[in-house]
């Protein structure tokens, strides 16, 4: 019992403070209407006014609306926090051509390097693909844009890189009605960059689904667009994304234009038999019985096996603190919590390896 530990109930009789068991210290009690900016505020400046959901407290102490990433060419990079706006960026496969505060006003699709060129720098959310001429060492398969989606490994071309600039959009001059033909041969496989749909007076929709620029004869700038629920694989083929429709699976990452959907076992289950981008067989997460102990192994990949505990040991299947509460820093998805009375398991990440501590408790290997 530490000598410097304050008197729990009253924090030495100071009504403006309270004792937080989780951090074992006295914390400043924020006045009514103000909320702590941290778990255990120490002074009045650690308290702030609470804004409405989707608002943040700006530098001038004003509640300001967080930007929204609801446009379909945007994804959330950082969430709306009490003191900072949500930050949006262009979704995978696109880059920002016109930036905006905490967001992007206009996203364009990454260019595909034309024939005779290879990718020097792949496109990011901020920058378009940078192409450079293929060096003599590049395989002949790179003679056409279809076969030259990625640079050949091992080749380091010396030529000066050529950034591919975004297509000049004509969409802003289009009438509100009619998209497909007025956008003169709107490419049936994504071209680089549709203009922002809002500029043609329509509600925002996925740029990949709205009229786009022409795909000129002989151009290498038209990215092949697969059907919904298909993705462009490394060989340039449209391949069906895996389905997570089985009851014991949940979607881990969505089906994107260039990557499959990935599935994982739902909370409370673990993968017994893995499969590409999914799990072929999920099993309920093992419960420690009184006379069994889980044998350490890679739980995410293999069937769980049980063996008798060493003589004289009693496995403890309740790794929670004595008061039955989880430590404040730990959430149920980060630690294995077993209710020893009800013998129920709480969710843990199905991909996390599980090991055993010296006491026989299952612990999460943070990797």
């Amino acid at each position: 019992f530490p000598q410097d530990r304050p008197f729990e109930d009253t924090c030495h009789g100071n009504p403006s403070h309270y004792y937080d068991k989780a951090v074992r210290r006295c914390c400043y009690r924020c006045p009514m209407g103000l909320f702590p900016t941290q778990q255990c505020p120490q002074r009045p400046t650690d308290c702030r006014k609470q804004c409405e959901p989707d608002y943040y407290l700006d530098e001038a102490d004003r509640c300001t609306a967080c930007v929204t990433c609801s446009r379909d060419d945007l994804v959330e990079k950082t969430p709306c926090a009490w003191n900072s706006s949500r930050v949006c960026e262009c979704r995978p496969g696109m880059f920002c051509s016109t930036s905006a505060v905490n967001s992007c006003a206009r996203c364009f699709f990454h260019s595909v390097c034309p024939a005779g060129m290879i990718v020097k720098f792949p496109g990011t959310a901020q920058k378009n693909t940078v192409c450079e001429p293929a060096s003599p060492g590049v395989s002949p398969a790179c003679a056409s844009p279809e076969n030259c989606k990625e640079p050949s490994s091992g080749t380091i071309p010396q030529a000066k890189p050529t950034p591919v600039s975004p297509a000049t959009s004509s969409a802003s001059t289009m009438p509100v009605r009619g998209g497909t033909r007025l956008a003169q041969e709107a490419a049936s496989k994504l071209t680089r960059a549709p203009d922002s749909p809002s500029s043609v007076g329509r509600p925002s929709s996925d740029p990949g689904l709205s009229p786009t620029q022409p795909c000129p004869e002989g151009s290498g700038d038209c990215r092949k667009q697969c059907e919904p629920d298909y993705y462009l694989d490394e060989a340039g083929r449209c391949t069906a994304c895996v389905s997570c429709s089985r009851d014991d699976l949940v979607e881990k990452t969505p089906c994107a234009w260039n990557s499959s959907r990935t599935c994982e076992c739902r909370p409370g289950m673990i993968c017994a038999t893995s499969a590409t981008n999914s799990c072929a067989r999920c099993v309920p997460y093992p419960i420690c019985a009184a006379e069994t102990v889980t044998k350490p192994q890679d739980m995410a990949e293999k069937d769980t096996t049980f063996e008798a505990p060493p003589l004289g040991t009693q496995p403890d299947c309740n790794p929670t603190p004595e008061n039955g509460e989880a430590p404040a820093s730990t959430s149920p998805t980060q630690s294995l919590l077993v209710d020893s009375q009800a013998s129920k398991t709480l969710p843990i990440p199905t991909s996390a390896p599980v090991a055993l501590s010296s006491t026989g408790k299952p612990v999460l290997d943070a990797g």
């Epitope: 379909d72 092949k224 919904p228």
Partner: antibody
């Protein structure tokens, strides 16, 4: 001007094969999916599949898979649909249609090719 | 596969009157904030002609009297004031899942 011109009508015996062509002009043939659609006499429309001429990638309707082969010749900007093991229910008009970008609609269609399967 | 149920099978409307055709999908056609529902018009001896894409966007060159609405699983095509040249078969199509499928068609005729 975008145009899709299909080959002429065919009369075939059951068990044989037919190959319908669709010549494209007025656009970058390699960069658009070419779809094929069946319409039996007095009936509705049935999607057969599609091909991306740029690399020969295909999607098929499972109902036709195994009997239908979609190919494309970039040099002549021509797409082909070959249907094998013909039976009487294959009698229909077959359309080729270009799929536009993004919204997956078919904006330009060929005039159609009537294939009659009769013994 | 996604089944599209189109109704009615046929529709007799007076010239100048409104005609509405419905199309119900067996599952949602939503995709990145839009619905992958298309509408085509087909006249005898001709290939289908694209009218509406993404459920409600009117293709260029298509008269203003045609409009599309709906989301999720329920969609409709409306001809606000029927003209003689609108006499045709109308088909809905979904592109949400492979294989793409069509509705059975609705025949629009003059009453």
């Amino acid at each position: 001007e975008v145009q899709l011109v299909q080959s002429g009508a065919e009369v075939k015996k059951p068990g044989s094969s037919v190959k319908v062509s669709c010549k494209a002009s007025g656009y970058a043939f390699s960069s658009y999916w070419m779809n094929w659609v069946k319409q039996a006499p007095g009936q509705g429309l049935e999607w057969i599949g599609q091909i991306y001429p740029g690399d020969g990638d295909t999607n098929y309707n499972g109902k036709f898979k195994g009997r239908v082969t979609l190919t494309a010749d970039k040099s002549s900007s021509t797409a082909y649909m070959e249907l094998s093991s013909l039976r009487s229910e294959d009698t229909a008009v077959y359309f080729c249609a270009r799929r536009i970008n993004g919204n997956f609609a078919m904006d330009y269609w060929g005039q159609g090719t009537l294939v009659t399967v009769s013994s | 596969e996604i089944v599209l149920t189109q109704s009615p099978d046929s529709l007799a409307v007076s010239l100048g009157e409104r005609a509405t055709i419905n199309c119900r999908a067996s599952e949602s056609l939503e995709y990145y904030g839009t619905s992958l529902m298309l509408w085509y018009q087909q006249k005898p001896g001709q290939p289908p002609k694209l009218l509406i894409y993404s459920a409600s966007n009117v293709e260029s060159g298509v008269p203003d009297r045609f409009s599309g609405s709906g989301s999720g699983t329920d969609f409709s095509l409306t001809i606000s004031s029927l003209e003689p040249e609108d006499i045709a078969m109308y088909f809905c199509q979904q592109r949400r899942k492979v294989p793409s499928t069509f509705g059975g068609g609705t025949k629009v005729e003059i009453k």
